[in-house]
Structure formats: structure tokens, C-alpha cells
């Protein structure tokens, strides 16, 4: 089936926005006013995955860019990266596992768990201007809770 997608922005629970930091990295920082235009707009696609009544599998692409967040092992550690894809073939309903995140909604907050690496989550640091990364702990120093803002197409 044609994949269903929506455009959105994400902010962590401390209200930090996500912006590009170089060609293949995202960072989280507080933005205000006109600077809000810097935040990345995601194209969130609803894909096949190990869906449950609590988890919805999604892929997170950057709107109008052929870049997707993906999870891979680097030096034996699950790592978040921005991966370039062929725009003719993506997005698709049957995304490879490294591109899939389980979107989990708890108390109006969202978590994004890697399908490839269960219990590893899209995370931000408490500190300003630090890279968005894949973290293996929840409820610690690092932030794994996000809110989603819909963006009209």
C-alpha cells in the first residue's frame, strides 16, 4: 500500500528543537522567534514493523531531503545516523529495520525506540547544542521524551 506520511517537528521535553548540524547530524537547542524556522521538519511515515497496541512503527525522514534517521552498530555500539537513500524508492511501507522506530505515547509524550535495537531510544542531552543520539537508558540524565507538532504539507 502507498505509505502514509505526515509532516511534523519534534521538541524534547525541555522544549529544545532539533536542527541540522552539518550534513549528517542533528543537534538539540532552544530556539525562539524567527530562529524557529531553522528546526528540521520530519516526514513521519507509518510503516510495517512489530506493531503492538502501544507501539506504532514509523520511519523519520527529513522533509524534501533523501535523508532518514537510521540505527546501526558503530564500534559495537547502537548509533543514530542520518542515512542518504534513493528518493525513487523511499519512503516505502516495508522499510528496512534500521530505519524503523517504535513510536510510543505515554502521558502525551512520545518516545522513539529503535526497532533494530530494542530499549535504545532517540535521545538528547540536558546540555545545549549537543547531537541527537541513540541512548540505552530511560529516565536518567538524557532526555527520551518528545512532543510532536504537526506541520501543514
Amino acid at each position: 500500500a502507498p505509505v502514509r506520511s505526515l509532516n511534523c517537528t519534534l521538541r524534547d521535553s525541555q522544549q529544545k528543537s532539533l536542527v541540522m548540524s552539518g550534513p549528517y547530524e542533528l543537534k538539540a537547542l532552544h530556539l525562539q522567534g524567527q530562529d524557529m524556522e531553522q528546526q528540521v521538519v520530519f516526514s513521519m511515515s507509518f510503516v510495517q514493523g512489530e506493531e503492538s497496541n502501544d507501539k506504532i512503527p514509523v520511519a523519520l525522514g527529513l522533509k524534501e531531503k533523501n535523508l532518514y534517521l537510521s540505527c546501526v552498530l558503530k564500534d559495537d555500539k547502537p548509533t543514530l545516523q542520518l542515512e542518504s537513500v534513493d528518493p525513487k524508492n523511499y519512503p516505502k511501507k516495508k522499510m528496512e529495520k534500521r530505519f524503523v522506530f517504535n513510536k510510543i505515547e505515554i502521558n502525551n509524550k512520545l518516545e522513539f525506540e529503535s526497532a533494530q535495537f530494542p530499549n535504545w531510544y532517540i535521545s538528547t542531552s540536558q546540555a545545549e547544542n549537543m547531537p541527537v543520539f541513540l541512548g540505552g537508558t530511560k529516565g536518567g540524565q538524557d532526555i527520551t521524551d518528545f512532543t510532536m507538532q504537526f506541520v501543514s504539507s
Epitope: S52, E96, K97
Partner: antibody
Framework: QVHLKESGPGLVAPSQSLSITCTVS????????VSWIRQPPGKGLEWLGL???????YYNSPLKSRLSIRKDNSKSQVFLKMNSLQTDDTAVYYC????????????????WGQGTSVTVSS | ETTVTQSPASLSMAIGEKVTIRCITS??????MNWYQQKPGEPPKLLIS???TLRPGVPSRFSSSGSGTDFVFIIENMLSEDVADYYC?????????FGAGTKLELK
């Protein structure tokens, strides 16, 4: 060789709960999901829900409040529990293995057990 | 939820005849349709998996076609051993949904 076998009580009294065990061999429950399906006498197939390799579950909405699926990976067993049974829950209950091929056919089912017949009657 | 409408409900065919069963889905499911055969007292057996792929060991007289919302299952030359119930299953999205089934009998 993939094999699934259901074992259940046969007869259940109305308003009581049903417990069925699916014992599998030839594949690991950590790698593949298992679905439950039922078939009332002379009728068609109804998909009840599934448990994935990682342990997450998905229940079909009409039965969600009455269903529970869990598993024991080390014993290669999947358990279906259904509460508050009524006569229209009389059916053959099947477990089936998910194909679980990422990026290809995640939701399809290939191998089925023989089924266990459950009659709800006082 | 994707609804699957299967037709006909029953078929009476002579040996050697061509059998055609159709399933229509309420949403576009690409090629994610599966076809099962069920004989009395037995569990369903997967004949054709998504992508119109014949399963290993299944005779070549069985085939299917279709994508999107319209799917057809064909038995090219019916044999007596093909008497059974046949079901389609969409595996595009959860919850998985079956067609109501087609009872194939011998004329």
C-alpha cells in the same frame, strides 16, 4: 522442521476463562512472532492477535479487553488466555507462525498448528 | 482496518475446469495478499504468499494475480483433491483480516 501444537481444555463453562498453550519446534520464539486464529464450527477464520519475537503484543480490537497472549521463550511455548467466554466463543483455536521477514513480509503467516477444539457449554 | 470481500461463497466445478476466486480489499494493500487451502479437519495451508508467490511444493496449477485492491486466485485444471475451503488473507496491515471463504465442491 517447523511444528506447532495447541493444547486446550476442550470444554469451558460460560463466563469462565480459556487457557490454551501452543508448543513450537523448529524455530525460536525470540526470532518469530506467533498469531492466534479461531474458527467457529462451519464458519470462517478470525484473527485474534499476535505476540512478536520481542514480546510485544497486538490484539484485535473486538476482543482486546478479553485477550491476553504471553510466552515462555525457553520452553518454546505461547499462551492464549481469553476471559468471560460465551457460547459464540465455541471454535477451533489455532496458533500460527509469522513469516517475519523485515522489509518483505512481516505480517504473513506460514505454518499453522492442527488446532484445538473448544466448546463453551454448561 | 482493511475489510476483505471474497466471492463466490461456494463453487461447484467439474474435474479439469478452471476455478476462479476473487478477493477485493477496502484499502490498497499493494501485493500483500495470501491464499490458503483448508480441507475438513485440517488447519489452513498456505498455497500462495504475498507477491503472488507460489509456496514450495505447491502444484503449478495454482496461481494468483492482482495488486492494490483486486486479487484473483486460479486453479487451472481442477482435480478431485482440490475440494476444500479457500481463504484469502491480507498481510499489509494489522489487524490481519481474512476473506469469508469459498467452498469448492465437485460437480
Amino acid at each position: 522442521q517447523v511444528h506447532l501444537k495447541e493444547s486446550g481444555p476442550g470444554l469451558v463453562a460460560p463466563s469462565q476463562s480459556l487457557s490454551i498453550t501452543c508448543t513450537v519446534s523448529g524455530f525460536s520464539l525470540t526470532d518469530y512472532g506467533v498469531s492466534w486464529i479461531r474458527q467457529p464450527p462451519g464458519k470462517g477464520l478470525e484473527w485474534l492477535g499476535l505476540i512478536w519475537g520481542g514480546g510485544d503484543t497486538y490484539y484485535n480490537s473486538p476482543l482486546k479487553s478479553r485477550l491476553s497472549i504471553r510466552k515462555d521463550n525457553s520452553k518454546s511455548q505461547v499462551f492464549l488466555k481469553m476471559n468471560s467466554l460465551q457460547t459464540d466463543d465455541t471454535a477451533v483455536y489455532y496458533c500460527a507462525k509469522q513469516r517475519t521477514l523485515w522489509g518483505y513480509d512481516l505480517y504473513g503467516m506460514d505454518y499453522w498448528g492442527q488446532g484445538t477444539s473448544v466448546t463453551v457449554s454448561s | 482496518e482493511t475489510t476483505v470481500t471474497q466471492s463466490p461463497a461456494s463453487l461447484s466445478m467439474a474435474i479439469g475446469e478452471k476455478v476462479t476466486i476473487r478477493c477485493i480489499t477496502s484499502t490498497d494493500i499493494d501485493v500483500d495478499m495470501n491464499w490458503y487451502q483448508q480441507k475438513p479437519g485440517e488447519p489452513p495451508k498456505l498455497l500462495i504468499s504475498q507477491g503472488n508467490t507460489l509456496r514450495p511444493g505447491v502444484p503449478s496449477r495454482f496461481s494468483s494475480s492482482g495488486s492494490g485492491t483486486d486479487f484473483v486466485f486460479i486453479i487451472e485444471n481442477m482435480l478431485s483433491e482440490d475440494v476444500a475451503d479457500y481463504y484469502c488473507l491480507q498481510s499489509d496491515n494489522l489487524p490481519l483480516t481474512f476473506g469469508a471463504g469459498t467452498k469448492l465442491e465437485l460437480k
